[in-house]
Amino acid sequence: ELCDDDPPKITHATFKAVAYKEGTMLNCECKRGFRRIKSGSPYMLCTGNSSHSSWDNQCQCTSSAARNTTKQVTPQPEEQKERKTTEMQSQMQLADQVSLPGHCREPPPWENEATERIYHFVVGQTVYYQCVQGYRALHRGPAESVCKMTHGKTRWTQPQLICTGETEPSQFPGEEEPQASPDGLPESETSR
């Protein structure tokens, strides 16, 4: 069941999921000057069964100027560089990670993808927050938000995080130490 709205916004913070529940949609958004091809789903969908989940549909962007020229899905190095470093690092880690049943990992980038990924999350999804570079995290509790269903309506829990002052960014679960559990989930990012 889709969450009715987006996760809460925290000033000077971004959020991300470490894995995406089945039913999650990722909009096929393209960077400026490009648009989604006309014959293709408007989003990718995390789908599958309890033993294996994967992203259905592929996003493809085409130049706004040359409507009929379809770009390849495989990202080129120059497009890859446009993604945030943290996300690129997560992509390289994917092969070494263990999958979480009923969840999809961060999908790889597509050529001419927009810089921000727009997800439609489902009930039960957890997203994790961290302060952006230059802000320090003051925790009053978990720096996470969960989409919950109550009385037939969905709502996101409020993350207990305030970002203030000047310091290094706080860290997401599983990122604290290099010796973290080898079966920790890959990092994946959604900026807001």
Epitope: L2, D5, D6, G23, M25, N27, R32, R35, K38, S39, G40, S41, P42, Y43, L45, T47, D56, N57, S64, E116, I118, H120
Partner: antibody
Framework: DVQLQQSGAELVRPGTSVKMSCKAA????????IGWVKQRPGHGLEWIGD????????NYNEKFKGKATLTADTSSSTAYMQLSSLTSEGSAIYYC???????WGQGTLVTVSA | DTTVTQSQKFMSTSVGDRVSVTCKAS??????VAWYQQKPGQSPKALIY???YRYSGVPDRFTGSGSGTDFTLTISNVQSEDLAEYFC?????????FGGGTKLEMK
């Protein structure tokens, strides 16, 4: 809560134009496409087109090209559709929809009559 | 354009029944199909996306299935509030197209 609030009913003369609005609330307006759908009794639902408020991109159903013009004002989180050179066939309820058709406005009734 | 056909304009049912509304696309649309419910004087309400996933707040008696060209919306244990018109829609390619609708009526 996500809400799409559409402008009120319109009574217009044949050959004239009408511009209706769809004000979005409860989500990031610039992140999601806004679509427009026409409904006439006995004709079901027809997709007119959509607009991405963040990039200004539009897609139109060929049938409505030159008839419908989609715009968006990000400062007020409002999408607009203008219909020109209206005939009796333009009499219908027009819905705006967003977030991959998950949310629909209440509809704007347009009546074209001399 | 992809044509979407709902061959049954009307279906009769009774409270507690199980009913299946069908929808056929003129070409392969994968699972890029949604189902909507519309009651008189109201806007369409989204029930199902991607052929089989329910939107939040939609009772689990509504089930979507199918892929390719043939799709089904099944309502098990029909309730009186389910009496409405049901539309399917393909969004696999532009222009997005809707089926003509199936009205669920009481026997």
């Amino acid at each position: 809560d996500v809400q799409l609030q559409q402008s009120g009913a319109e009574l217009v003369r044949p050959g004239t134009s009408v511009k209706m609005s769809c004000k979005a609330a409860g989500y990031t307006f610039t992140n999601y496409w806004i679509g427009w759908v026409k409904q006439r009794p006995g004709h079901g639902l027809e997709w007119i087109g959509d607009i991405h408020p963040g990039g200004g991109y539009t897609n139109y159903n060929e049938k409505f090209k030159g008839k419908a013009t989609l715009t968006a004002d990000t400062s007020s989180s409002t999408a607009y559709m203008q219909l020109s050179s209206l005939t009796s066939e333009g009499s219908a309820i027009y819905y705006c929809t967003s977030r991959n058709f998950a949310y629909w406005g209440q509809g704007t009734l347009v009546t074209v009559s001399a | 354009d992809t044509t979407v056909t709902q061959s049954q304009k009307f279906m009769s049912t009774s409270v507690g029944d199980r009913v299946s509304v069908t929808c056929k696309a003129s070409q392969n649309v994968g699972t890029n199909v949604a189902w909507y419910q519309q009651k008189p004087g109201q806007s369409p309400k989204a029930l199902i996306y991607s052929a089989s996933y329910r939107y939040s707040g939609v009772p689990d008696r509504f089930t979507g299935s199918g892929s390719g060209t043939d799709f089904t919306l099944t309502i098990s244990n029909v309730q009186s509030e389910d009496l409405a018109e049901y539309f399917c829609q393909q969004y696999n390619s532009y222009p997005y197209t809707f089926g003509g609708g199936t009205k669920l009526e009481m026997k």
